[in-house]
Each structure stands twice: as structure tokens, then as C-alpha cells.
């Protein structure tokens, strides 16, 4: 028969013929022969292969360090990766995560839109006319000038958008 | 700083048992095992066995199976190793140590001297 | 299970020689680890996953196999080196350590 040139999904070809892939956590010990099957072994501890493969090594853990402030989110099988993340308060440089940096905290005049997460970054927006933030944070939002007139007073200094507006008694007309 | 702290030497009689502890700090105890060894005086390193203290999880060697328990406090970060039915060949410096990629060091605790005595 | 067979059991090398210290399993396992220890400390990892040296472990250390044989070796001795060596297995339960090697300085 003519040898194949191509081969089914989890197989691959080698010498003219077809072998069997390793399943996911384990690697290639040695191709498969017209007499023999693909010998495999399982990856050790703190080793892993995510996929149907013929890899001779299996890939180590990642390492999710705490002096760069990352922790472990999800603890590595031999088929999966560890998946690191970062401590409270700050959030990853990367995609792959490899390291942290302190959230972003938003200025005085500037309040958080979004909530940083181990991932994102906080987003700041300048307060709008009628909102003040007068404090330095990753958490607050700008916060809406105080209505004088619904507790009676009148407004006895302009807020900004760092400050909030000064409330002050009304002036009583003298008969 | 990555340690592993265990607790101190053991003066035991044959058929007592004895619990040893081992405390983590620098690292979440859950997230990686935590192995047991053990070392006869002027004899070489023994595996006794391992805990996932995320989940319990634990595997001895057969020659310990039933006479050694490990447990995990993910609370105290700390990992015990309890064996039972002591006997004068158990006298041994006993070490708690990690997954080996922890900081690329594999930390070792200081080793706890165990006695077995009448 | 597996058993792990270190070989020399004890060996002395003069300062600058070459040193190979070898560990045959019953089967093929994924990787070994090798260990360091010296009288009265706790053991330490020196080599993992067969060939990667473990932090502050001197370049002039190295390791290598596959399968069933592996092997660590040390381009010139050194007296700081005098300590015994242990290779471990953590591919299949129980894992387990060879008997150790005594590397003694001439």
C-alpha cells in the first residue's frame, strides 16, 4: 500500500506513516513503528502538556512569585498550566501576567469610571460640572455636589471639581 | 522570604505517635504540595509521602501507608505529618519541603530529630 | 515502583578534576531532580527538572539524561563541593531517591 501522506486528527506522520499523538499531560518517549505504538510517559510533578502532542519535554509550572505580587489563581494539572494572577491592589503588566503594578489611583478632580481587577488597570474620568472629587483613589467615584436648596440653604461658595459647593443660611429680608 | 518552619525535637516511647508541624510563610501553603522526608542517622533521604493542602489530597509510600497521616491547615498555613506505632527504626530527623519550582529553591524545612526510646 | 540506583556510592576527586555522578531508574521517569547535602543541614535542591541549575548554584555544576539514566556532573572540583548528592524521581508514586552519593575532596 502506498504510505499515507497525510493523517487523522491526534495522529501524526513519521517514517511514511502515521503515529498516535501523546494525550494532553503526558510526552514522547519514542515514535511508533510497523510493529510498535507510540510510547508516551507522563509528565512529573510541576510539569504539564496542554495538548495532543509529541513533545519530548513537558513544560514546567509557571512560578507565580509573590516578591513581583503575583498568587496563584488556579493551581497547574500535568494537562494545564499554573494561572497566576495579581495580589489586592494591583493588577498584571501583561497578558501572560509574568508581572504586577500597583493600581492607579485617580487625582483630586478625576473619579474612578471602572474598578481596577488583577488584570485592568483603574480608569479615571474628570469630574463633570456638578460632581468633586477632593481625594487621591482607586475606589472612588466623583461624587455629586451637595443640593443646597433641598435643605434650605443657598449655595454660599461655587464648587469645583475638586471641592464641593459651601451650603450657607438664607438671608432673612428685615421688616 | 520563603520559610518553612518545623516544629521542635520529639522524645517518643515505642508504639507512641507523634505529630510533627511544619509552617509556611512567603507563599499561600494551598497553592503548592507540601512533601515529607525521611532521614536516618547516617542513612540516605526516604519519601514518605505528600499533601495538596488545597484539597487534602495526600499519597504515601506503601511503607508508611497506614501508619502516617498528613494533614494541612490552609488557615495557619501550616502542614502536619503525624505517625503512629513508633518504633526504634522511626528514629530519624523527619523534613517537610515543597513543590521543587517554588522560587527555583525547592525550600526544606529544618528538620524536626524524632527519639524512639524505652 | 521505581528504583533509583546512584552510582559511585562514595568517590574523592582532587580540586579541578572532573566529577560525574550517575542515576539509573528502573524505568523511564519525565525528569530528576538532584539535591545537595552537607553534615547536619538540610538538603537543598541544586538541579531541577534534569539539567536546570537551581538559584546560587555554581555554573560549573551541570546535569543531563533522559529516560532511564541521568547524570550530574562538575567541570572542575571544588572543596565547597565535598557534600553527599541524592537524585530524586516525581514522576510516579512513591516517588523516590537514590541512595546517595558521598563526593569526597582529595
Known amino acids: 500500500p502506498e504510505p499515507p501522506t497525510a493523517c487523522r486528527e491526534k495522529q501524526y506522520l513519521i517514517n511514511s506513516q502515521c503515529c498516535s499523538l501523546c494525550q494532553p499531560g503526558q510526552k514522547l518517549v519514542s515514535d511508533c513503528t510497523e510493529f510498535t505504538e507510540t510510547e508516551c510517559l507522563p509528565c512529573g510533578e510541576s510539569e504539564f502538556l496542554d495538548t495532543w502532542n509529541r513533545e519530548t519535554h513537558c513544560h514546567q509550572h509557571k512560578y507565580c512569585d509573590p516578591n513581583l505580587g503575583l498568587r496563584v489563581q488556579q493551581k497547574g494539572t500535568s494537562e494545564t498550566d499554573t494561572i497566576c494572577t495579581c495580589e489586592e491592589g494591583w493588577h498584571c503588566t501583561s497578558e501572560a501576567c509574568e508581572s504586577c503594578v500597583l493600581h492607579r489611583s485617580c487625582s483630586p478632580g478625576f473619579g474612578v469610571k471602572q474598578i481596577a481587577t488583577g488584570v485592568s488597570d483603574t480608569i479615571c474620568e474628570p469630574c463633570p460640572v456638578g460632581f468633586f472629587s477632593n481625594v487621591s483613589s482607586a475606589f472612588e467615584k466623583c461624587h455629586p455636589w451637595t443640593s443646597c436648596e433641598t435643605k434650605d440653604l443657598v449655595v454660599q461658595q461655587a464648587g469645583t471639581n475638586k471641592t464641593d459647593v459651601v451650603c450657607g443660611p438664607q438671608d432673612r429680608l428685615r421688616a | 522570604e520563603v520559610q518553612l518552619v518545623q516544629s521542635g525535637a520529639e522524645v517518643k516511647k515505642p508504639g507512641a505517635t507523634v505529630k510533627i508541624s511544619c509552617t509556611v510563610s512567603?507563599?499561600?501553603?494551598?497553592?503548592?504540595?507540601i512533601h515529607w522526608v525521611k532521614q536516618r542517622p547516617g542513612k540516605g533521604l526516604e519519601w514518605m509521602g505528600r499533601?495538596?493542602?488545597?484539597?487534602?489530597?495526600?499519597k504515601y509510600d506503601p511503607k508508611f501507608q497506614g501508619r502516617v497521616t498528613m494533614t494541612a491547615d490552609t488557615s495557619t498555613d501550616t502542614a502536619y505529618m503525624e505517625l503512629s506505632s513508633l518504633r526504634s527504626e522511626d528514629t530519624a530527623v523527619y523534613y517537610c519541603?515543597?513543590?521543587?519550582?517554588?522560587?527555583?529553591?525547592?525550600?526544606w524545612g529544618q528538620g524536626t530529630t524524632v527519639t524512639v526510646s524505652s | 515502583q521505581i528504583v533509583l540506583t546512584q552510582s559511585p556510592t562514595i568517590m574523592s576527586a582532587s580540586p579541578g578534576e572532573k566529577v560525574i555522578i550517575t542515576c539509573s531508574a528502573t524505568?523511564?521517569?519525565?525528569?530528576i531532580l538532584w539535591f545537595q547535602q552537607k553534615p547536619g543541614t538540610s538538603p537543598k535542591l541544586w538541579i531541577y527538572?534534569?539539567?536546570n541549575l537551581a538559584s546560587g548554584v555554581p555554573a560549573r555544576f551541570s546535569g543531563s539524561g533522559s529516560g532511564a539514566s541521568y547524570s550530574l556532573t562538575i567541570s572542575r572540583m571544588e572543596a565547597e563541593d565535598a557534600a553527599t548528592y541524592y537524585c530524586?524521581?516525581?514522576?510516579?508514586?512513591?516517588?523516590?531517591f537514590g541512595g546517595g552519593t558521598k563526593l569526597e575532596i582529595k
Open positions: 519541603t515543597t513543590s521543587y519550582y517554588v522560587g527555583t529553591y525547592g525550600y
Open positions: 512567603g507563599f499561600n501553603i494551598k497553592d503548592y504540595y
Open positions: 499533601i495538596d493542602p488545597e484539597d487534602g489530597d495526600t
Open positions: 524505568s523511564s521517569v519525565s525528569y
Open positions: 527538572s534534569t539539567s
Open positions: 530524586q524521581q516525581r514522576t510516579f508514586y512513591p516517588y523516590t
